[in-house]
Interface confidence: low
């Protein structure tokens, strides 16, 4: 999927744009807002009725190299008594992010943008029940 | 930077870390995933901590459209379909990387930007504080 070039309806291309070879783009990987931190409620992964665990995946040829994935602990949801209620479902909530992938072909190195689907956490849903004749 | 194993047969001039600026292919690898969460699943309506999705659009960013979740209630929906305020709906937030046009308006020059998005909501038992 190509990154859409922005049409002239939005803006004209400034003269100051750096020259870029055809079929590629220049990417500065010094991250804007690098030190921003998530300020989620404390321990929501344990306090949720659809609790989850975290796993860290590590890939030295990916930037960022560390990606954290969540996995729902149960098929059902935890009820007020702390028991699993299988009439409800714990389901993963996912979000896309971008990473930069480094590829080695012989001694040459190329870089590729990649979409990665991250499981962020879980939520408890009422199941869809189909009545079949 | 990130250290990587290097092919021992390659010249030593190769940098072990990611350089600050790279040229990348315009094609983004990995499935044409459906970026509209309203179409990809109806969890936002079926959840006990339902949420609404708000479209955030910025032509200077890729992807230009990001969907932000806002929990509909303070409490969670119980078995009777009513809001139970003994439980809390809370947003699940995630840092994601996007591309920011830099310099602004340039078609093929970007910088990575970290942004915080609320992806959905989950129902949690509240932390109760007893105030004297």
């Amino acid at each position: 999927r190509k990154i859409p070039k922005v049409g002239h309806t939005f803006f004209q291309k400034p003269e100051s744009c750096p020259p870029v070879p055809g079929g590629s783009m220049k990417l500065d990987i010094g991250i804007i807002n690098e030190n921003q931190r998530v300020s989620m409620s404390r321990n929501i992964e344990s306090r949720s009725t659809s609790p989850w665990n975290y796993t860290v995946t590590w890939d030295p040829n990916r930037y960022p190299s560390e990606v954290v994935q969540a996995q729902c602990r149960n098929l059902g949801c935890i009820n007020a008594q702390g028991k699993e209620d299988i009439s409800m479902n714990s389901v993963p909530i996912q979000q896309e992010t971008l990473v930069v992938r480094r590829k080695h072909q012989g001694c040459s190195v190329s870089f590729q943008l990649e979409k990665v689907l991250v499981t962020v956490g879980c939520t408890c849903v009422t199941p869809v029940i189909h009545h079949v004749q | 930077g990130i250290t990587i194993p290097r092919n021992p047969g390659c010249p030593n001039s190769e940098d072990k870390n990611f350089p600050r600026t790279v040229m990348v292919n315009l094609n983004i690898h990995n499935r044409n995933t459906n970026t509209n969460p309203k179409r990809s699943s109806d969890y936002y309506n079926r959840s006990t901590s339902p949420w609404n999705l708000h479209r955030n659009e910025d032509p200077e960013r890729y992807p230009s459209v990001i969907w932000e979740a806002k929990c509909r209630h303070l409490g969670c929906i119980n078995a009777d379909g009513n809001v139970d305020y003994h439980m809390n709906s809370v947003p699940i937030q995630q840092e994601i990387l996007v591309l920011r046009r830099e310099p602004p308006h340039c078609p093929n020059s970007f910088r990575l930007e970290k942004i915080l998005v609320s992806v959905g909501c989950t129902c949690v038992t509240p932390i109760v504080h007893h105030v004297a």
Epitope: - | N52, H54, K70, C71, R72, H73, L74, V83, S89
Partner: nanobody, 123 residues
Framework: EVQLVESGGGLVQPGGSLRLSCAAS????????VGWFRQAPGKEREFVGA????????YYAVSEKDRFTISRDNSKNTLYLQMSSLRAEDTAVYYC????????????????WGQGTLVTVSS
Amino acid sequence: EVQLVESGGGLVQPGGSLRLSCAASGRTFSSYVVGWFRQAPGKEREFVGAISGSGDSIYYAVSEKDRFTISRDNSKNTLYLQMSSLRAEDTAVYYCTADQEFGYLRFGRSEYWGQGTLVTVSS
């Protein structure tokens, strides 16, 4: 985009009643949770109450639930606050506010706010 304009404020004697109105512009009024906040002189803005888009869920601050009544008329794009048994401590600027989620409105983080109308309770 929603514009909110409050009216109905004024001077009232202790024990008296007053009805505030909030007229909203925009065709999507019924999709918003709307409510009232108030700010007394020298104090922080506080939540009074709110009502869901359809009007079937109404939320009151515990201290006001017996004296104040919130209602809405979606055909007129209007929110109301009926106040009775007014006391001197009810003197404040009353603000109308709207958001698509009650959770945001409840904690004063609404998307839309009116300019406010002053209610003075004094003999």
